[in-house]
Interface confidence: low
């Protein structure tokens, strides 16, 4: 028998009997993928003296197309499978008559989740086995008897990673408007440790809770024009794959080290989150790497600290916020949380107190927009494969899918006058609804800057006058000189920079003589090598936690725990004048260039990292020989 969970009980709750409204009487053949749970459903709940009508729609984008589940089979072998028939019972929506409301519930066995009206966050869960029409408890989070949970990310580490904090940075935007940029997507991989598995008792119970949690996290992030899509779930039903310590910082380092080793054979994801049943030391319930999203350190650990899954969902949303560059609200002068004070704090408050937060503060949004300006954030721009989203295209999910011209979310959330939110078609007279080259529902003229140059290895992009999206981000031609190195796919890799990335600010490239060692497995032997393109050798700084090192003389190389693989000098790193590391060897810069590409750009553009002409403002690809206006005139009006 799985040990019972030391969850606290509710102090005050109201008993309600939800009433399901009859669905539309439409007789048609339903596609087989719709399964047992309807696409849309509405419930009436009588609570706190009101009748709340919840309109819900299935979260068709909860699971990515290649979603996998990994667990240990009875014979002890690890199994990864893509479950078929991914019907589920996780819904999102709003409360009728309340413009800024939100709801996130599961209907699998009764109703469980939250709905938010104004500043009040109501939690609902079944009291018995009576299903959706049975007795349910509706209560507010402050009536859940629990201790306050805190985030383990220290203000010191935040300060050093986020820079100076001043009130001036945070100009509040109207509370109801989404950021006007394109939707971003976090492809999430969730790991559930053995302690959590033991407490929940079965793979099915774990799966259910995780999907519930991710559904809530996704709903919280939708207000920031983000979607959180689960691409993989790993359940440690037999034993933990690394030591899950009560010290959350140790557990995080162990998670990230383990993830680095697994990455080649597991999902390529943007972010990994551990959900643990281990009770972290003190009041800490979560710990994360700050500004690490899209890097090898993109992850966090979360203690499942509350009976209601909204608790760990808020923790995960908070820790993911740190991954996205957000600071604790208390650390920022002038930070505004629109949340009514007695209803609690915003998501990035350092401790959750007695109530679950439901929104991000102005400063969290400003930190996020700042993070998205970094080249590092590029992994969030790619949507999961929209042709394969589980459940097919659905209007109102913020994904522009087959048959749609735009998608600004459900009608109650849509604030985009260029898009008809009920049909996902452009409004009358609109040329576009989304994109940085779309302004006031019209495509911006050719030559307008849409993506400025970020650094010396970047190129600026201009609107082409035909498409609402800014052209794909392009970079200086590989081999262009940059600070101490040569540009390579938009980066400027140098030995010093690599050492600092792993060993911290004090990290430096080791002496040149160190690079003459090629370390063999086990750190036992080495042989002579003629260049600096083998193992990355550093000195100074602090040894990354959870990483083993191999020391030869004064040279430090990072290795996996078993000593079989070493951190290599990355491709494109400068290894001498006019020389770069390429395929593990120090080679002349001309390995990047097969021909004199720039000569083909007619002096109206330069060559980019793909060896294609990147045209100056107003000139047309592929060879920048004609003005965009001439090309457009010849080919007719907008598509």
């Amino acid at each position: 028998i799985a040990p019972s969970r030391p969850w606290a009980l509710m102090e005050q709750y109201e008993v309600v009997l939800p009433w399901r409204l009859p669905g539309p009487r439409v007789r048609r053949a339903l596609p087989s993928h719709l399964g047992l749970h309807p696409e849309r459903v509405s419930y009436v709940l009588g609570a706190t003296g009101h009748n709340f009508t919840l309109h819900l729609r299935k979260n068709r984008d909860l699971l990515g197309s290649g979603y996998t589940e990994t667990y240990t089979a009875a014979n002890g072998s690890e199994v990864t499978e893509q479950p078929r028939g991914q019907d589920h019972c996780f819904y999102q929506g709003h409360v009728e008559g309340y413009p800024d409301s939100a709801a996130s519930l599961s209907t699998c066995a009764g109703l469980r989740g939250f709905f938010q009206v104004g500043s009040d966050l109501h939690l609902i869960e079944p009291l018995d086995e009576g299903g959706e029409g049975g007795r349910h408890a509706v209560y507010q989070a402050e009536h859940l008897l629990q201790t306050a949970g805190t985030c383990g990310v220290s203000d010191d580490s935040l300060g050093s990673l986020l820079g100076p904090r001043t009130a001036a940075v945070f100009r509040p935007r109207p509370g109801d408007s989404l950021p006007s940029r394109e939707t971003r997507y976090v492809e999430l991989y969730v790991v559930v440790d053995n302690a959590e598995f033991q407490m929940l008792g079965s793979e099915a119970a774990v799966r259910h809770r995780v999907l519930e949690v991710v559904n809530h996290v996704d709903k919280l992030y939708q207000k920031l024009n983000f979607r959180v899509v689960l691409v993989g779930l790993e359940i440690w039903n037999s034993q933990d794959r690394f030591h899950v310590s009560p010290d959350p910082s140790v557990t995080l380092e162990n998670l990230l080290t383990w993830q680095a080793r697994q990455r080649t054979r597991r999902h390529l994801h943007d972010n990994v989150q551990l959900i643990t049943g281990v009770d972290f030391t003190g009041t800490t319930v979560g710990f994360a790497r700050v500004s690490a999203m899209c890097s090898h350190s993109s992850g966090a650990v979360n203690q499942d600290h509350s009976k209601n899954p909204v608790g760990v969902a808020c923790t995960m949303a908070h820790e993911m916020g740190h991954n996205l560059g957000m600071d604790h609200d208390e650390n920022v002068q002038g930070c505004r949380c629109q949340e009514r004070f007695e209803a609690g704090r915003c998501i990035m408050a350092g401790s959750i107190g007695s109530s679950f937060p439901r929104m991000f503060s102005d400063c969290s949004q400003a930190y996020l927009e700042s993070f998205l300006e970094r080249p590092q954030s590029v992994c969030l721009a790619n949507a999961p494969d929209l042709s394969h989203l589980v459940g097919g295209p659905v209007c109102g999910n913020l994904f522009v899918e087959r048959g749609e011209q735009c998608d600004c979310g459900p009608p109650e959330d849509c604030r985009n006058r260029c898009c008809n939110s009920t049909t996902c078609q452009l409004a009358e007279g609109a040329q576009c609804a989304h994109g940085t080259c779309c302004q006031e529902c019209k495509v911006k003229p050719a030559g307008e800057l849409c993506r400025p140059k970020k650094d010396m290895c970047d190129l600026e992009e201009f609107c082409d006058g035909r498409h609402p999206e800014c052209p794909e981000d392009a970079f200086q031609e590989n081999g262009t000189p940059c600070s101490g190195g040569y540009c390579y796919n938009g980066a400027c890799p140098t030995l010093a920079q690599q050492c600092q990335a792993f060993w911290g600010p004090g990290g430096q490239a080791a002496e040149e003589s160190c690079f003459s060692y090629d370390i063999l497995p086990g750190c036992k032997a080495s042989r002579y090598r003629a260049d600096m393109c083998g193992v990355l050798q550093c000195k100074g700084g602090q040894q990354p936690l959870g990483r083993a090192i191999c020391i030869v003389d004064v040279c430090h190389a990072l290795t996996t725990e078993d000593g079989t693989a070493y951190e290599p000098v990355p491709e494109g790193t400068r290894c001498g004048p006019e020389k770069v590391c390429w395929k593990g060897r120090c080679q002349d810069l001309h390995v990047y260039r097969s021909s004199n590409c720039s000569a083909q750009c007619h002096n109206h553009g330069v060559c980019n990292h793909k060896q294609e002409c990147h045209c100056h403002a107003g000139w047309a690809p592929p060879h920048c020989a004609k003005l965009l206006t001439e090309v457009h005139a010849a080919s007719g009006s907008l598509p």
Partner: nanobody, 119 residues
């Protein structure tokens, strides 16, 4: 070449505060890390605090953690060291230094500014 000029040193009582400034000029776009170092009489030079120019990651020697804060203003090409709760053992010549993208060493140094803390 990068030129560094420190200012802000002086004589203070124990427990007082001082703010040092280091203004960089020249090829400042090449700077990757800037730091404050100090040399006390009869001792080796030690790193006090460093900051990465682009992403503002800071590092402090244990003896100054919680008392000293390094900040940078990219627009002014200036790095500051705010020193609070000064102790007599903080007495030293404080140097500003810069490390560039293509070097693993601090290759540019200022002339130094004297900080004296009396008990």
């Amino acid at each position: 070449e990068v030129q560094l000029v420190e200012s802000g040193g002086g004589l203070v009582q124990a427990g007082a505060s001082l703010k040092l400034s280091c203004a960089a000029s020249g090829r400042t776009y090449d700077i990757r890390v800037m730091g404050w170092f100090r040399r006390a009489p009869g001792k080796d030079r030690e790193s006090v605090a460093t900051v990465t120019w682009r992403d503002n990651i800071t590092y402090y020697v244990d003896s100054v953690k919680g008392r000293f804060t390094i900040t940078r203003d990219n627009a002014k090409n200036t790095v500051y060291l705010q020193m609070n709760n000064l102790k007599p053992e903080d007495t030293a010549v404080y140097y500003c230094a810069a490390q560039t993208e293509d070097s693993a060493q601090y290759i540019y140094w200022g002339q130094g500014t004297q900080v004296t803390v009396s008990s």
